[in-house]
Amino acid sequence: CKAMHVAQPAVVLASSRGIASFVCEYASPGKATEVRVTVLRQADSQVTEVCAATYMMGNELTFLDDSICTGTSSGNQVNLTIQGLRAMDTGLYICKVELMYPPPYYLGIGNGTQIYVIDPEPCPDSDF
């Protein structure tokens, strides 16, 4: 069976600054040189693309300049960081990996990481 398995943590809690990081790991059935990683958000049965990046093995992940995602790669592992998260962004974040080149193409989709985001309490006014 030449399928591609993608693993990611079940739950991640975003920091008070609205930053969440998780690892997306894939078991490559072939020797890919070009990989595309997409983060999908699923909430209320709606699916939206959060960000996507294509990278050459051994090189850094490059997301678009206006992307809320950053990441680094090491072998078959991608370390993803999503920034600017607010409580309304709580949801299931799914890692989708595609081995683009060389042929054959392979698709792998993780089970998703539930990211919980809690908006920080506003600081109380002080007399100081």
Partner: antibody, heavy 118, light 106 residues
């Protein structure tokens, strides 16, 4: 709304060429891989080709490799299929289809008929 | 290349009956979809990931299975369900379809 509309089909002689187009609307075209699938009269579905995202990666079915070329113009939200050295067995309805977020073909065009006959 | 074999070729049933369609793969597949096609129309995605219903698909359609054996079930056939159904694997290239099962009115 989200849709794909094919055009360019027609009757052509064996050995000649034809170019099909597929106009996309209602979604961010450059974020999706797009396929061509064909269906010979009274037959089943046959995958033909795919082009991914920015157009740098393309895959073809063995039956069309070396004769057909898939391309896309993201600025025009349009997919193309250049068909050369056409054969009678290429006669079919040609559909373009979007590979959705999960990979399955979630949006299809209405199809355009290509008839290769002398 | 993964070969998908659908059975039966034709299924003759009456409205209200249950339809069970089979799709068998020549090797294990991770990603399988089901499509419905009516005469003169383009295919329509019903099920992806073997068991997830596509947007807007009625819950009388359900998919199950894993590995090499997959099933599409239509719990109660409506008049508009009489059509040809195709399975497809999409987890690796080349993408392949089954030969189709025709569900016709008995």
């Amino acid at each position: 709304q989200v849709q794909l509309v094919e055009s360019g089909g027609g009757v052509v002689q064996p050995g000649r060429s034809l170019r099909l187009s597929c106009a996309a609307s209602g979604f961010t075209f450059s974020s999706y891989g797009t396929h061509w699938v064909r269906q010979a009269p009274g037959k089943g579905l046959e995958w033909v080709a795919v082009i991914w995202y920015d157009g740098s990666n393309k895959y073809y079915a063995d039956s069309v490799k070396g004769r057909f070329t898939i391309s896309r113009d993201n600025s025009k939200n349009t997919l193309y299929l250049q068909m050369n050295s056409l054969r009678a067995e290429d006669t079919a309805i040609y559909y373009c289809a979007r590979a959705g977020n999960w990979g399955a073909f979630d949006i299809w065009g209405q199809g355009t008929m290509v008839t290769v006959s002398s | 290349e993964i070969v998908l074999t659908q059975s039966p070729g034709t299924l003759s049933l009456s409205p209200g009956e249950r339809a069970t369609l089979s799709c068998r793969a020549s090797q294990s597949v991770s990603y399988l979809a089901w499509y419905q096609q009516k005469p003169g129309q383009a295919p329509r995605l019903l099920i992806y990931g073997a068991s997830s219903r596509a947007t807007g698909i009625p819950d009388r359609f359900s998919g199950s299975g894993s590995g090499t054996d997959f099933t599409l079930t239509i719990s109660r056939l409506e008049p508009e369900d009489f059509a040809v159904y195709y399975c497809q694997h999409y987890g690796s290239s080349p993408w392949t379809f089954g030969q189709g099962t025709k569900v016709e009115i008995k």
